[in-house]
């Protein structure tokens, strides 16, 4: 697994470098997670043909994966910093159950899957420090999450491969949108 941000050899060799600002740390953290997702997608796509065939194969998706919408205030038109930040944090909290599902879904990238999960938890903490309106952030219900996790794991092998692909694709898109929005803040 890649070394988490702030722990690479360059940091050790450059003790006089200015410490990262909160925004820089968040930016670096998201890029680190995106690198991890890329590695996981590589294994998924090599293992099956889901990545090419998912569009034709899938008729309906009821996974309810978090997605950015116009009303969330994260796009350039209608940009709203506070609304957007709440959406990013809420979305990441909703993704946590899907990231939990991804553990045990990878053979050669097991550590990478764990790194993505743990780095996302750290990212949420960074963002929560940045948010002024923490009351607006709804935390997913643990019982609902437990039930969803059971359903995800009860799917047959083919559907689990498809689910893995869809989660990674959606998480990548969500993080990319988040990164663009946070750079405007």
């Amino acid at each position: 697994a890649p070394v988490p941000p702030g722990e690479d050899s360059k940091d050790v060799a450059a003790p006089h470098r200015q410490p990262l600002t909160s925004s820089e740390r968040i930016d670096k953290q998201i890029r680190y997670i995106l690198d991890g997702i890329s590695a996981l997608r590589k294994e998924t796509c090599n293992k099956s043909n889901m990545c090419e065939s998912s569009k034709e194969a899938l008729a309906e998706n009821n996974l309810n994966l978090p997605k950015m919408a116009e009303k969330d205030g994260c796009f350039q038109s209608g940009f709203n910093e506070e609304t957007c930040l709440v959406k990013i944090i809420t979305g990441l909290l909703e993704f946590e159950v899907y990231l939990e599902y991804l553990q045990n879904r990878f053979e050669s990238s097991e550590e990478q899957a764990r790194a993505v999960q743990m780095s996302t938890k750290v990212l949420i903490q960074f963002l929560q420090k940045k948010a002024k309106n923490l009351d607006a952030i709804t935390t997913p219900d643990p019982t609902t999450n437990a039930s969803l996790l059971t359903k995800l794991q009860a799917q047959n092998q083919w559907l689990q491969d498809m689910t893995t692909h869809l989660i990674l694709r959606s998480f990548k898109e969500f993080l990319q949108s988040s990164l663009r929005a946070l750079r405007q803040m």
């Epitope: 034709e56 194969a57 899938l58 008729a59 309906e60 998706n61 009821n62 996974l63 359903k151 995800l152 009860a154 799917q155 047959n156 083919w158 559907l159 498809m162 689910t163 869809l166």
Partner: nanobody
């Protein structure tokens, strides 16, 4: 033990109609996707139609769109396939399929967990 039993197949002339039924037992399929697939001699099993357990949305193969209608009666735990304007190329064994979770609905056979034994449909010209 889950069982899917198809019925309603038979011999029909081109342009005719048939209504296939698939009765499920051993578990409730009301929230699960259900589908119909078919296999003609010497050919691969192909998707015909599917119905969502949640939304009730229906999906069809291009070859049957406008001629076939899939529906379900959750109270009877039964799925139907109304086949109109039948053509000789519709001749095949028709299989009913069910999926146990219902988070994804797919047109791929591997995405289904339970299968019936099939019912023969023969369309003569």
């Amino acid at each position: 033990e889950v069982q899917l039993v198809e019925s309603g197949g038979g011999l029909v002339q081109a342009g005719g109609s048939l209504r296939l039924s698939c009765a499920a037992s051993g578990r409730t399929f009301s929230s699960s996707p259900m589908g119909w697939f078919r296999q003609a001699p010497g050919k691969e099993r192909e998707f015909v139609a599917a119905i969502s357990g949640r939304s009730g949305n229906t999906y069809y193969a291009d070859s049957v769109k406008g001629r076939f209608t899939i529906s379900r009666d959750n109270a009877k735990n039964t799925v139907y396939l109304q086949m109109n304007s039948l053509k000789p190329e519709d001749t095949a064994v028709y299989y009913c399929a069910g999926e146990r979770v219902g988070l994804l609905l797919t047109v791929v056979a591997e995405g289904y967990d339970y299968w019936g034994r099939g019912t023969q449909v023969t369309v003569s010209s």
